[in-house]
Interface confidence: low
Amino acid sequence: PPGGVVVRDIGDTTIQLSWSRGFDNHSPIAKYTLQARTPPAGKWKQVRTNPANIEGNAETAQVLGLTPWMDYEFRVIASNILGTGEPSGPSSKIRTREAAPSVAPSGLSGGGGAPGELIVNWTPMSREYQNGDGFGYLLSFRRQGSTHWQTARVPGADAQYFVYSNESVRPYTPFEVKIRSYNRRGDGPESLTALVYSAEEEPRVAPTKVWAKGVSSSEMNVTWEPVQQDMNGILLGYEIRYWKAGDKEAAADRVRTAGLDTSARVSGLHPNTKYHVTVRAYNRAGTGPASPSANATTMKPPPRRPPGNISWTFSSSSLSIKWDPVVPFRNESAVTGYKMLYQNDLHLTPTLHLTGKNWIEIPVPEDIGHALVQIRTTGPGGDGIPAEVHIVRNGGTSMMVEN
């Protein structure tokens, strides 16, 4: 193999490599190939050279296309008509000269933070793009529409964000931002301009036309007109606050909608109770002002008595069940129908049946000998107390059972 590989004239992207001819095995050397690697673990790769094709009588060539401020080792491989020889031993390790960065940082983005802040993020540049010592980032930013760029120097290759804090920064304001890197040899090229928003603040506007209505003894529906997206941030949803008439608003419970719904159902309320309700918009920064309050009264509770006097009849493939209607008291809500849960002895889970009458017929397999039935009222106040009975197939006759 060739020997005596020596590096001379080290530049930022080029070096001059010299070597001595090795034994040609009685066949003239036709050409040389130069390879480089970045120690300690880099793989040997062929490099561009000047001249591009190195003839067999050459003992020096220039290596092109190297990265500034990078460690390299080089080796030489000779070829003749018989084939390619063993590579030379590696040259001593050298470091190319420094140069100003040649690539702009990427991943420019940002947003968030506290009121009055503009946060800008980017992807830190790896060692191969730093090109020299004293590396850092130079950030330029201006409010969209402004002509004056402000700049900030952020030292350190690992830096990945910058926070500009100023009381004059209005909430959720778009800023044009660009970035370049620098080292002690100079500044690199600028990135493309990105649009980054300053930190959000709470919404300024309250929802309007808030309307609330009790829909059961423990629930109410709340609807409202949405707020327009204001300049303070991205609207995330609405917060409903509700409290009993006679209580202080400070004692209010609250529920937030996930998304920009304009209605919500609030549950866990007391029956036959008047509530005050307000709605507020919220974003990442917090909650906005309250709407005017609306009122809603929950329904009277469902009857506290289960259906009684339950009887049934089996046919070959169906089961008919009837019961006495439940008549609500004055302080109870109306009965609009009945819910029946049916569970046979083949399954762990019941099926739900609804009827507006005081009887129901359901299909059952012929091999069902007995089943559990649960019947309860349903109505505007919600579901009532269930009656549970164990029924047995008994030659198609009717039977009465106690609850």
Epitope: A258, G259, D261, T349, P350, L352
Partner: antibody, heavy 117, light 108 residues
Framework: QVHLVESGGGLLQPGGSLRLSCAAS????????MSWVRQAPGKGLEWVSG????????YYADSVKGRFTISRDNSKNTLYLQMNSLRAEDTAVYYC??????????WGQGTLVTVSS | EIVLTQSPGTLSLSPGERATLSCRAS???????LAWYQQKPGQAPRLLIY???SRATGIPDRFSGSGSGTDFTLTISRLEPEDFAVYYC?????????FGQGTKVEIK
């Protein structure tokens, strides 16, 4: 008997727009919430959007939020899905469904939307 | 969003055998708002179970659902030839509504 028939599918390029319709019959349309669900070729089901009976509230999957709009015309017993800024990943069979106790109780047979350049 | 994970991915059984399909939620499913659907090739899905345990209209009683919170099960007590299909669970308790990735029940 509940009957749902989707229409409006077709082949279009990325960035294009399309409006799907779902004609409903056999039930009191205005009393029921409706939904759109899609299924990419050979893939699972993905809920797209939902709308309450009176049309007052709408809901969207994150993947379509801001691009798709669900609406309904209760006088025509028809559900719509307006799809804008379509992408290749929106290619799917789109089903409309009637909600029963919150679940997707009745489904149409679907309409194929293909987004390809 | 709530992520639903179904297991197993594929279930190889013979007609007459019992099939047990599992659906696990990444967080509690509100009010047991969980449904099961059956889908056969080239067809729209069909609702089997809603409210975690209530069979939909016209669904044979060999299909049953159980569970609450984060763990739900669909059981097919005796597989009929027409039951071999893909089964999906779906939660509708919180937006966005989400589906599991599906369990394929195939003939062994």
């Amino acid at each position: 008997q509940v009957h749902l028939v989707e229409s409006g599918g077709g082949l279009l390029q990325p960035g294009g727009s399309l409006r799907l319709s779902c004609a409903a019959s056999g039930f009191t349309f205005s009393s029921y919430a409706m939904s759109w669900v899609r299924q990419a070729p050979g893939k699972g089901l993905e809920w797209v959007s939902g709308i309450v009976g009176n049309g007052g509230s709408t809901y969207y999957a994150d993947s379509v939020k801001g691009r798709f709009t669900i609406s309904r015309d209760n006088s025509k017993n028809t559900l719509y899905l307006q799809m804008n800024s379509l992408r290749a990943e929106d290619t799917a069979v789109y089903y409309c469904a009637k909600l029963e106790w919150g679940a997707l109780g009745y489904w149409g047979q679907g309409t194929l939307v293909t987004v390809s350049s | 969003e709530i992520v639903l994970t179904q297991s197993p991915g594929t279930l190889s059984l013979s007609p007459g055998e019992r099939a047990t399909l599992s659906c696990r939620a990444s967080q509690s499913v509100s009010s047991s708002y969980l449904a099961w659907y059956q889908q056969k090739p080239g067809q729209a899905p069909r609702l089997l179970i809603y409210g975690a345990s209530s069979r939909a209209t016209g669904i044979p009683d060999r299909f049953s659902g159980s569970g609450s919170g984060t763990d739900f099960t669909l059981t097919i007590s005796r597989l009929e030839p027409e039951d071999f299909a893909v089964y999906y669970c779906q939660q509708y308790g919180s937006s966005p509504w989400t589906f599991g990735q599906g369990t394929k029940v195939e003939i062994k």
